[in-house]
Structure formats: C-alpha cells, structure tokens
C-alpha cells in the first residue's frame, strides 16, 4: 500500500522539514526560514510561533518543530502549549479580575496561582485538626479524636497540601 501510495502521490515522499512544492513540479523543498513541517507529505509549512511580550522562548523553532514559549518572571503559563500568560500572586492570595487579593480567614492558597480554598473540615472526614490552617496552608488533619487516646501510636502528619511551585489547578 505504501508503495502504491508513493507512486500515486509523490508528496508522500517529502520528509518532515520540507513541503511538496506544487510550483516546482511537486519537488520536496525545504521549509523557508521561520516555518516548519513536523510530519512528512505536507503541501505547506506552518509559520513558527513567535514568543513576544510577556512570552519568552523556551525552545527555538526548527524546520521540523514549532517554537515553544513560556512566561517571563512574575507570570505563569495557562492553557495548552502555554497559550496565555497569567500574573502570579503570592501564596496566601488569589488572582481576581481586580488583581491579587489576600485570602479571607478560613481559606488558603499555597500557590502563586489559583483560588483561595476553604480549609479542609477535618471533622467531616471523621478526623481532627493536627495543624491549624493559615492563609498559605490548609489545615493538616490527623487521626479521629477517638484514636488520640493515651497509648495510641503517634502519627506522622501528611504532606502539605501541595508543593510550592507545582500547579495543581
């Protein structure tokens, strides 16, 4: 089948990094500067993404792959392939349409992005509060109050809600 297809369609022989040039008798021509083709058999090359403004280049464009962008300091990526850059806030804050706002009492945000979330209500899961919450940290729930009787073995507190610098959202 492959052989038959290549006999019928000479473009199928054009590798990534080239395009099938109709203006030149369907010869495989290299992609022009600032363009790429990531698969073979393409009749055009795609324009390279340009990382401008708040975007910065994480990976340069090549003849076979598009450029990749990330965000300048103070911003973080949003969306597939970092399609947007969103302002960072501090831990203990959330980004609203009016900018960064401190978390209200009883809520926390341990990231530079995302919402202020209510502290976990340990009692709803049959547990007790081991470590109180702050604006930057969720409460840490421990064993149920009944488990804390004298002689009960000590419990290692669970890890904090999320590691700073990692996006849960």
């Amino acid at each position: 089948f492959e052989r038959t297809r290549s006999l019928q369609d000479p473009c199928s022989n054009c590798p990534a990094g080239t395009f099938c040039d109709n203006n030149r008798n369907q010869i495989c021509s290299p992609c022009p500067p600032n363009s790429f083709s990531s698969a073979g058999g393409q009749r055009t090359c795609d324009i390279c993404r340009q990382c401008k403004g708040v975007f910065r280049t994480r990976k340069e464009c090549s003849s076979t792959s598009n450029a990749e962008c990330d965000c300048t300091p103070g911003f973080h990526c949003l969306g597939a392939g970092c399609s947007m850059c969103e302002q960072d806030c501090k831990q203990g804050q959330e980004l609203t349409k009016k900018g960064c706002k401190d978390c209200c009492f009883g809520t926390f945000n341990d990231q530079k992005r995302g919402i202020c979330r209510p502290w976990t209500n340990c009692s709803l899961d049959g547990k007790s509060v081991l470590v109180n919450g702050t604006k930057e940290r969720d409460v840490v729930c421990g064993p149920s109050p009944a488990d804390l009787s004298p002689g009960a073995s000590s419990v290692t507190p669970p890890a904090p809600a999320r590691e700073p610098g990692h996006s849960p959202q």
């Epitope: 969306g79 969103e86 349409k97 209200c104 809520t107 919402i115 840490v140 999320r162 849960p168 959202q169």
Partner: antibody, heavy 120, light 106 residues
Amino acid sequence: QMQLVQSGAEVKKPGASVKVSCKASGYNFGGYYMHWVRQAPGQGLEWMGWVNPKSGGTNYAQKFQGRVTITRDTSASTAYMELSSLRSEDTAVYYCAREGEAVGLDLDYWGQGTLVTVSS
Amino acid sequence: SYELTQPPSVSVAPGKTARITCGGNNIGSKSVHWYQQKPGQAPVLVIYYDSDRPSGIPERFSGSNSGNTATLTISRVEAGDEADYYCQVWDSSSVVFGGGTQLTVL
C-alpha cells in the same frame, strides 16, 4: 492521552452506601484537584465536592456534608466518592471531573459517568 | 448562596447565531465557564475564563461576561451543536452551575 475512567453502574437499596471510583491516566494525578458532580435524570449538574489528591484535603457542598466522603489512592491514581444513607432522590449519574487551570476554577476533563440507581 | 439563571431553552436555525445567557449578581466580577452536554454523554468544557476556548473547540464558540450577565455565543450554528449548555462559576466555597439551557437546532 488524558483519561478518567469510572467504575460501572450500581443498584442500591435505600439506606445503603455506594462507592464510585475514578481512575486517572495520562497526567500527573497528584497535581490536579478532583471533583465530583452528579446529574439526576432529566436534571442539571450538581457539584458535590473535591479532593486534593496530594494531601487528601477535601471540601464538600453543604447539601452533602455528613453523607459524602471523597478520598483518593495516589498509588493507584484513583479518586473515590462514597455516598451513604441513600434515598431514591440520589438516583443519578455521578461524574468525576479534573479541575483545570483557569482563573476561577473550571473542570476541564470529565469521566464517562456512573449511573447509581436507588430502588427498593 | 450564589445562583445562576439560564433560559430553559433556545431555538435557532442552522447557520444562524445562538446566544445563551447566564445571569447572576455581579457575575462580571467572576470567571464564567461553559459546558456542552449531548444526550448520554459527559459534559465538555467549551469556554473557560469568560471567553477562552480549549484546544479542539471551534472558533464559532465565543463568550463574554459583564455586569449581571454572561453570554455564550455560537455562530453559524450546526446540527451537531444541539445539546444542553451549562454555565459555571466558583463562589467562595462551592462550585455553582446554572440550570442549563437546551439548544435546539431547527
């Protein structure tokens, strides 16, 4: 490829409990909150709560507090929703949904749903 | 608790523009997300953060949000757009959905 695969349909008697599972694959399970949403026949979407897969921290809708427990098993990349004291009004399709990255909390990927029927 | 109000149904002819509204007190200050749900299927996110489209969602889908109303606009409506549409916001401690709007393509 990102996927959330839920356990199969359940039929329960009033007063019983049901536990629905949601296995995640194709992404870092510990990095995204997991939510549960239900939909009664012919009705709209109703949020039940979330679990932080990294810490196990939870938040429940007031309506379900005391009846719902959302947990996770990080080693199995699976979230669970248990609903107790079932009544006929709990007959619904239950969805798990991954929290996305947008400002203000969106749900970007959903499981296929699990039908729970409560009938005597 | 915060409430979101959607019209139960909207009808539109193929090729025309459908507008589905979502009302809420000062909703313009919140981020609104929209989901499409076809019969027997799970919801699919079609608009997030008022007006952004996830990859794979056609450009025909757009959103806006100001004042007390958010709007999902579907231009050049196709038969395949027939579905239920839900708006959603985050309000202090809970995720809130609108009641849903059934879009019928005539």
